[in-house]
């Protein structure tokens, strides 16, 4: 069974998938569409890297531009380095500026909804 066939079989169960499962899926050429991606748990999407999301979505990665202001895409963008987002070539804006350090302070983030940044 190829990645696409596997994805079709598990698609309806993905809404509650944890980050680890999404990372694993990204290695299987599943080409997840944005309709499915947008239904994933935000907390499961946030830890994914740009490279992982690119692999997870495959050719559908262009759809991130269409949903850049909607959750979970918006929240995911805020967590990525702008340099990494730029590699997608989609014109996504709102990533962490170059030279900034991200402090993973869970309490700070829980309160503000965004990661804590330290300037250069």
């Amino acid at each position: 069974m190829n990645g696409s066939e596997y994805f079709v079989k598990i698609q309806s169960f993905l809404g509650g998938a944890p980050t680890e499962d999404l990372k694993a899926l990204s290695q299987q050429n599943v080409s997840m569409d944005l309709a499915t991606f947008m239904k994933l748990r935000t907390d499961a999407v946030l830890p994914l890297t740009v490279a992982e999301v690119q692999k997870l979505l495959g050719p559908h990665v262009e759809g991130l531009k269409a949903e850049e202001r909607h959750r979970p895409v918006r929240d995911w963008i805020l967590r990525q380095r702008q340099d990494d987002l730029d590699t997608l070539g989609l014109g996504l804006q709102g990533g962490i500026p170059n030279g900034y350090l991200v402090l993973d302070l869970s309490m700070q983030e829980a309160l503000s909804g965004t990661p804590c940044l330290l300037g250069p």
Partner: antibody, heavy 119, light 106 residues
Framework: EVQLQQSGPELVKPGASVKIPCKTS????????MDWVKQSHGKSLEWIGD????????IYNQKFQNKATLTVDKSSSTAYMELRSLTSEDTAVYYC????????????WGQGTTLTVSS | QIVLTQSPAIMSASPGEQVTMTCSAS?????MNWYQQKPGSSPRLLIY???NLASGVPVHFSGSGSGTSYSLTISRMEAAFAATYYC?????????FGGGTKLEIK
């Protein structure tokens, strides 16, 4: 068959509010955002905003930020747009139109609701 | 916001004639969509992502362009194609539409 069914014409007084429904059928409601578009008489189209049925998250054209509120009722696959503090400038035809998540074109449109604001 | 300027505003064509209308963006956009609207009806998607024909649209229609300049071409005019045509960009919020080109039949 995909359908976006809007309500009939509305005549309301200045200062009042109105809530326009858009009842959908024939597709998976949560696979599409619902966008709303304004067309004043004899004029072009203006994008008001869109809402994601999965998160209830709405995004607005800044021009309509204080005019429109978009909501959805997933149980009935219906989207709503409420317009408040109505003036004659709000007299127009309002369309709901669907946009597949990840795409930026509107492939099916409602028939439009004509709103007339007059005392 | 990005302003889309359509030209001409009004044009007429004879049956069988080729028709081209343009849409100019105030700054670069990724893709362009085109819609057809007849009096008393809702807009109808014709072309999406610059050059893709929407479902059920006659092959007479085609779209092209990049950057700030886009066009819609009808290879052979028919009476049924008399309508107003709108371009729409999706690259920058808010989404915007052009002012329209009204196409009449001679």
């Amino acid at each position: 068959e995909v359908q976006l069914q809007q309500s009939g014409p509305e005549l309301v007084k200045p200062g009042a509010s109105v809530k326009i429904p858009c009842k959908t059928s024939g597709y998976t409601f949560t696979d599409y955002n619902m966008d709303w578009v304004k067309q004043s008489h004899g004029k072009s189209l203006e994008w008001i905003g869109d809402i994601n049925p999965n998160t209830d998250g709405a995004i607005y054209n800044q021009k309509f930020q204080n005019k429109a509120t978009l909501t959805v009722d997933k149980s009935s696959s219906t989207a709503y747009m409420e317009l408040r503090s109505l003036t004659s400038e709000d007299t127009a035809v309002y369309y709901c139109t669907r946009r597949k998540l990840g795409r930026k074109f509107f492939d099916y449109w409602g028939q439009g609701t004509t709103l007339t604001v007059s005392s | 916001q990005i302003v889309l300027t359509q030209s001409p505003a009004i044009m007429s064509a004879s049956p069988g004639e080729q028709v081209t209308m343009t849409c100019s963006a105030s700054s670069s956009v990724g893709y362009m969509n085109w819609y057809q609207q007849k009096p008393g009806s809702s807009p109808r998607l014709l072309i999406y992502d610059t050059s893709n024909l929407a479902s059920g649209v006659p092959v007479h229609f085609s779209g092209s362009g990049s950057g700030t300049s886009y066009s819609l071409t009808i290879s052979r005019m028919e009476a049924a194609f008399a309508a107003t045509y709108y371009c729409q960009q999706w690259y920058v919020y808010p989404y915007t539409f052009g002012g329209g080109t009204k196409l009449e039949i001679k």
